[in-house]
């Protein structure tokens, strides 16, 4: 017989992505005895849960946790039995269960009790369910995109830890109820609501971040359809022959068309609505989301909000990556500069259903709506943040890492579970998000 | 009621290529799409491509990418897939099928098949 | 590269229920498409939209799509059954269409 190394014990997190549109599960590992190194945590698995997202069960909370049971039964089997105990389990919900949380606050404390009760009775390490404020979810993205590109530390071939000189990168997140954009700063920010002061691996980071609630695809959608129900009579954005049966109850329940919503509307009314394969009038309809009219700060992105000039590059995640990728795959349409963005968002606004259909088969209804999608990409990142052709160049738009999906999620566990120290290697504490 | 007929079977030396094509008669290629799907001898079926014929518009399975090429000839209502640099691993029966919008542009309508043999 | 998982081979009793899935990642936010090959024979599409039927296709054929798994379902299952079943379904991401493995239904008495 002779000695074999055994291969090193490894440790396993849960966390929950409860989103407005949907929940996803990811299962992260990292070696036991590399707990504080950098760049050592991986996905191990993830789960969609079938379904809308835990806030599209505020009538039926234990709906809400019903869905989640699939998934929870597969971690079961994706994190090994010895390790179950020892597993720490998340949920984070985000902008849709914000925007619960403001127009029913009951509800939504009845699901998050509901999710909770059955998220304690599987055998991990539950460590709560809570709502992610957009300021969180702006830098746990972040930190998760920096973490998996390993810019904030590396070990050295001399077998030094060094803090690489590339810099950090700055992460955009376009959800379905909200969108973050978060980046490194020098200067401090006009508006402290708006700063983050982190320290990791013994390095001091200022990060702006805004998280712009009601600016995710999802309600950016439905703000469009109540705005061309109220100013058209027809649907600029969708494609000529394409129409549908609207129930106004659907557009005018969520909190980000309340200020469309009509004096006396019947909520169980429908309206035919077609699409005119207008992309003019369309990028006039997604200009009337942004206002720029005051700002009481030096600089302001839209809507009064202090932002400074975007610096450095920057990864673009979750529903920017699918705009842009869907305008680059399946529309075969270049879109490298923003010139090009705005171009192939143009092209795309100026296909009929039938063309659109042809072009990409086999998919749902919402093929409709990358116009407006892909316009409101390119009308936020030029206009709105103020991306110019050069800072343009320094996007990427991605949705992995290292095999590892790019969202709050897993900054969000490195923090919880300490697994970023604030000091550097060598010396072992947590992480200090002040 | 549109029929699509392809041309006969071929028997190719490795390093060559071969054209196949699908006629549709009874009908046109209007608002249709084409897609090529073949099937190794015993194997499962693998899409290789397809053409919108009405929209110029083609797309191609990345592992074909380079080596295959999908055309259409509207007035004579006839689509041709061209596979170049074949190897034994390409015998099998390339399909031609017609993507209609009445089912969002899946295959509704196949023909029997080409069998392409590659052999040296 | 997206893929889709189905079982090599199903067996049913004649005039029992036949279920075949397909599973994917977040499958059902997409269309789903049953195909079925008997030997020596072109595909014949069964089930479009996860759960319409083309004309002339029997009302024993149906589909379910939802989460990450996909699913044929042939009730009252006859000899004439027994054929080779593949899912399709189209991916975006890399602009293709997937098909599954391909399943092989036997119908047993």
């Known amino acids: 017989t002779r000695d074999v190394r055994e291969p090193p014990a490894l440790k396993y997190g849960i966390v929950l992505d409860a989103g407005s549109s949907h929940t996803s599960m990811f299962i992260y590992k990292w070696p036991a005895d590399k707990e504080n190194d950098t760049g050592i945590v991986g996905q191990h698995s993830s789960c969609d849960v079938p379904g809308g997202g835990i806030s599209s069960y505020a009538d039926n909370p234990s709906g809400a946790s019903q869905s989640l049971v699939g998934c929870l039964e597969q971690a079961l089997q994706d994190v090994p039995k010895e390790r179950h105990a020892g597993t720490p389990l998340y949920l984070g919900a985000t902008a849709g269960m914000r925007l619960l949380n403001l127009t029913n606050p009951e509800a939504s404390t009845s699901v998050l009790m509901a999710v909770t009760h059955t998220l304690t009775q599987y055998p991990f390490d539950f460590r709560g369910a809570r709502i992610l404020s957009g300021q969180e979810e702006g830098v746990f993205g972040w930190v998760t995109a920096n973490y998996l590109l390993e810019n904030f530390i590396k070990y050295g071939w001399v077998g030094r830890w060094f803090r690489p000189r590339k810099g950090t990168l700055g992460a955009m997140d376009l959800g379905g109820a909200s969108t973050q954009i978060t980046f490194e700063t020098t200067s401090p920010a006009e508006d402290r609501a708006s700063e983050v002061q982190l320290h990791l691996y013994g390095q001091h980071y200022r990060v702006y971040t805004h998280s712009f609630l009601c600016y995710g695809r999802d309600q950016v959608l439905q703000r469009l359809l109540a705005s061309a129900l109220q100013t058209h009579g027809f649907h600029p954005c969708w494609p000529r022959g394409f129409s549908t049966q609207v129930l106004l109850g659907d557009v005018y329940q969520s909190p980000c068309t309340m200020a469309q919503r009509p004096q006396n509307f019947n909520s169980s009314a429908r309206v035919s609505l077609s699409g005119s394969s207008d992309p003019h009038l369309c990028r006039d309809l997604v200009s009337g989301l942004f206002s720029f009219s005051s700002c009481p700060f030096s600089r302001c992105s839209f809507n009064g909000v202090f932002q400074p000039p975007v610096a450095g590059n920057f990864v673009a995640f979750s529903a920017f990556f699918y705009t842009v990728d869907f305008l680059r795959t399946s529309m075969g349409l270049p879109v490298a500069t923003l010139q090009q963005l705005e171009a192939a968002a143009v092209n795309v606004c100026n296909q009929t259903w039938a063309q659109l259909q042809a072009r990409v088969p086999g998919q749902r209804a919402r093929l409709a709506d990358y116009c407006a999608g892909a316009m409101f990409v390119q009308q936020l990142l030029s206009r709105g943040y103020g991306f110019d052709e050069r800072a343009f160049g320094g996007v990427i738009f991605q949705k992995k890492a290292a095999d590892t999906a790019v969202g709050w999620a897993l900054g969000y566990m490195l923090n919880l579970t300490n697994l970023i120290p604030a000091d550097p290697p060598g010396l072992r504490k947590g992480t200090d998000f002040s | 009621q549109v029929q699509l007929v392809q041309s006969g079977a071929e028997v190719k030396k490795p390093g060559s290529s071969v054209k196949v094509s699908c006629k549709a008669s009874?009908?046109?290629?209007?608002?249709?799409?084409v897609s090529w799907v073949r099937q190794a001898p015993g194997q499962g079926l693998e899409w290789m491509g397809r053409?919108?014929?009405?929209?110029?518009?083609?797309q191609y399975a990345q592992k074909f990418q380079g080596r295959v090429t999908i055309t259409a000839d509207e007035s004579t209502s006839t689509a041709y897939m061209e596979l170049s640099s074949l190897r034994s691993e390409d015998t099998a029966v390339y399909y031609c099928?017609?993507?209609?919008?009445?089912?969002?542009?899946?295959?509704?309508?196949w023909d029997q098949g080409t069998l392409v043999t590659v052999s040296s | 590269s997206y893929e889709l998982t189905q079982p090599l081979s199903v067996s049913v009793a004649l005039g029992q229920t036949a279920r075949i899935t397909c599973s994917g990642d977040a499958i059902g936010e997409k269309y789903v498409y049953w195909y079925q090959q008997k030997p020596g024979q072109a595909p014949v599409l069964v089930i479009y939209?996860?759960?319409n039927r083309p004309s002339g296709i029997p009302e024993r054929f149906s589909g379910s799509n939802s989460g990450n798994t996909a699913t044929l379902t042939i009730s009252r299952a006859q000899a004439g059954d027994e054929a080779d079943y593949y899912c399709a379904s189209y991916d975006l991401q890399q602009a293709r269409w997937v098909f599954g493995g391909g399943t092989k239904l036997t119908v047993l008495g």
């Open positions: 099928a017609r993507e209609s919008p009445g089912y969002r542009y899946s295959f509704d309508v």
């Open positions: 009874g009908g046109t290629f209007d608002s249709y799409a």
């Open positions: 939209d996860d759960n």
């Open positions: 053409i919108v014929p009405w929209l110029g518009h083609t």
